[in-house]
């Protein structure tokens, strides 16, 4: 019996035209909601006249649907055993499932103003960019609607810029009718252990945004992983979003809808700092906003986004160290809302149910020749939002999922 | 080392077109403002403007506007400055210099002297 | 435009004694003024920059203060090699604007 299941399960998971693994890899069958906190800032005045705490207070949820769009351009290759997609982006707003409107309004960093000295460091360009801030009446902070915040609007001090520049800025932008990928994953063919493991990401091997093995693509897309997962397996995988491959180690079983799940998490030491875990030291890529790579918990992806000073980190700076927090007020770490785990069946490999939760944030630093930031007398790392991206396998397909897989093992 | 070279003196005639150029080395060309200078003899200094030659965003004192035009040359790391309708009172020692990010004019060409006579 | 005036206008001072120029600008510049010496026939040479920053390989006789408005270039004991041209640069804005110079000589 154990071998005729097993034998099922390899062919079924397989990621080819007419498997289970296949039907559901294409278009996922989960309905995936992404939820967002803004960090409204209460004090901007005060922030930007005398460099004091920021006080931010979350407003949310505020729900998209997300995911719902199937794999394009999907081609087979036997000679290497591999399927190469790309994944459409689309986000459509759920107003049942939200606080309030897309046009709901936020005090928020100034992305441009904050972003600019950071990308042009030479003073002159700096003195021209703040006459063209001062011109445009911009401030360190600007208030904003969600729709403008999240997917773009048309910012009026990058408007007076000279010369050609992307006028439009967004924590998402563009994000619908844009695509993620191309992936090129191993569809398991000839060998079931490297199912779903990306071979390339946009035509390489390396993201060239880190040194050494930080650069490295390794494991899926976190949607499944190869059959058979035992306990003391590290997940790996790779998520574009914030740029790097990560992993998840094992917390606990889980009885999801009946059935057994394992539910791996992402551990603390995967966003520590080298000092304590050595393996992350090609993840510290500067040394002064680091403390000579000591803080931890707040990962720089600037190179991964044309140089503009974006830094990722778990919701309300979980598992960040002290000097990260400090700047802020109205932070409330809390584990079980804000990290992030996998519940992964593991005859079969499929994430059924997931939590994606991340922070995105803004460093914004002193700039002499910048009267909107030269009251600064420290840098920040700024919150700007957080999200959780969620799935859990519908009662539907659970039922049928119980009765051709774990029922059978039973 | 960094170093700026310009180009020889010029005698000009009233009317007339000059373009002067400033040769970099020893540095990352594209990152660093190149300005333009003027002494007249015996004079105090007159900022003509700057280009950065990344984007090639220029920005000119309102008063040589018209006068000046600068232009970078990325692939030979060369910037230049042509001055059109001379006058007596353009003749004059024309620098190049370069900033060093936050440290304006760290670095100096040696001057070109540009001599309006009929 | 920010226009800065400098004085005095020539100085002529004995070796060893303390050399003082002042720069007063038009606008509140902050701390953005710069100080050049220039010798006949050589380029100006940064002496020392934006907020009093002294750079590196000038001697420390050379010191600046002030903000706002107000700029004093130093010079602690006058050495013969000290003799040439100075000038205020105002860095806080465009256009950017020079100081009409001091002659310094020995006496």
């Known amino acids: 019996g154990d071998m005729l299941i097993e034998k099922t399960i390899k062919r079924e998971v397989v990621l080819e035209e007419g498997t289970t693994a296949f039907k559901n890899w294409v278009k996922t069958g989960t309905t995936v909601y992404r939820q967002f906190w803004i960090f409204d800032v209460q004090n901007p005045d005060d922030v930007a006249k005398n460099s004091s705490k920021i006080k931010v207070k979350q407003r949310g949820p505020y729900t998209y649907r997300v995911r719902y769009l199937a794999k394009e351009n999907i081609t087979q290759d036997p000679e290497d055993h591999t399927v190469s997609f790309v994944q459409p982006n689309g986000a459509i707003f759920e107003p049942s499932l939200s606080v309030g409107t897309e046009d709901d309004n936020f005090t928020v960093l100034n992305l441009a103003v904050a972003a600019a000295p950071h990308i042009y460091q030479n003073s002159f360009v700096q003195v021209v960019l703040n006459s063209l801030i001062k011109k445009s009446k911009s401030s360190m902070f600007q208030t904003r609607s969600l729709k403008e915040l999240l997917w773009g609007y048309k910012d009026p001090f990058l408007s007076l810029v000279p010369y050609p520049i992307s006028t439009t800025v967004g924590v998402f932008y563009p994000y619908n009718d844009t695509v993620d990928g191309v992936y090129k994953v191993f569809n398991g063919k000839d060998n079931i252990s490297k199912v779903a493991i990306i071979e390339s990401y946009k035509g390489k091997r390396n993201l060239s945004y880190w040194p050494s093995y930080c650069d490295m693509i390794n494991g899926t897309d976190a949607a499944s992983f190869p059959p058979f997962v035992e306990k003391s397996r590290t997940l790996r995988f790779f998520s574009s979003d914030i740029c790097r491959s990560i992993y998840a180690v094992f917390g606990s079983e889980i009885d999801l809808k009946g059935i057994p799940v394992y539910r791996f998490v992402l551990p603390a030491n995967a966003f520590a700092s080298p000092l304590q875990n050595p393996d992350n030291h090609c993840f510290c890529t500067e040394k002064v906003i680091s403390n000579n790579c000591t803080s931890y918990g707040v990962l720089d992806i600037g190179k991964c986004k044309e140089g503009k000073p974006v830094y990722i980190s778990l919701p309300h700076f979980l598992h960040a160290s002290p000097d990260v927090s400090e700047p802020i007020e109205g932070l409330h770490p809390n584990e079980d809302e804000h990290r992030t785990y996998l519940d992964v069946e593991p005859i079969t490999g499929f994430t059924l149910q997931f939590a994606k939760r991340l922070q995105v944030n803004i460093l914004v630093k002193p700039a002499r020749k910048i009267e909107a930031l030269k009251n600064l007398k420290r840098p920040y790392i700024v919150p700007i939002l957080w999200l959780n991206e969620t799935g859990t396998i519908g009662d539907e397909k659970a039922e049928m999922f119980k009765t051709q897989v774990t029922g059978k093992i039973k | 080392e960094v170093q700026l070279q310009q180009s020889g003196p010029e005698l000009v005639k009233p009317g007339a077109s000059v373009k002067i150029s400033c040769e970099t080395s020893?540095?990352?060309?594209?990152?660093?403002?190149m300005h333009w200078v003027k002494q007249s003899h015996g004079k105090s200094l007159e900022w003509i403007g700057g280009?950065?030659?990344?984007?090639?965003?220029?920005k000119y004192n309102q008063k040589f506007k018209g006068k000046a035009t600068l232009t970078v040359d990325k692939s030979s790391s060369t910037a230049y400055m042509e001055l059109r309708s001379l006058t007596s009172e353009d003749s004059a020692v024309y620098y190049c210099?370069?900033?060093?990010?936050?440290?304006?004019?760290?670095?100096w060409g040696q001057g070109t002297l540009v001599t309006v006579s009929a | 435009e920010t226009t800065v005036t400098q004085s005095p206008a020539s100085l002529s001072m004995a070796i060893g004694e303390k050399v003082t120029i002042r720069c007063i600008t038009s606008?509140?510049?902050?701390?953005?003024m710069n100080w050049y010496q220039q010798k006949p026939g050589e380029p100006p040479k940064l002496l020392i920059s934006?907020?009093?920053t002294l750079r590196p390989g000038v001697p420390s006789r050379f010191s600046s203060s002030g903000y706002g408005t107000d700029f004093i270039f130093t010079i602690e004991n006058m050495l013969s090699e000290d003799v040439a041209d100075y000038y205020c640069?105002?860095?806080?804005?465009?256009?950017?604007?020079f100081g009409a110079g001091t002659k310094l000589e020995l006496k």
């Open positions: 640069l105002q860095s806080d804005n465009l256009p950017l604007t």
């Open positions: 020893g540095h990352t060309f594209t990152e660093y403002t």
């Open positions: 210099a370069r900033d060093r990010y936050d440290v304006w004019f760290a670095y």
């Open positions: 934006e907020g009093n």
């Open positions: 606008t509140d510049i902050d701390d953005d």
């Open positions: 280009i950065y030659p990344n984007n090639g965003a220029t």
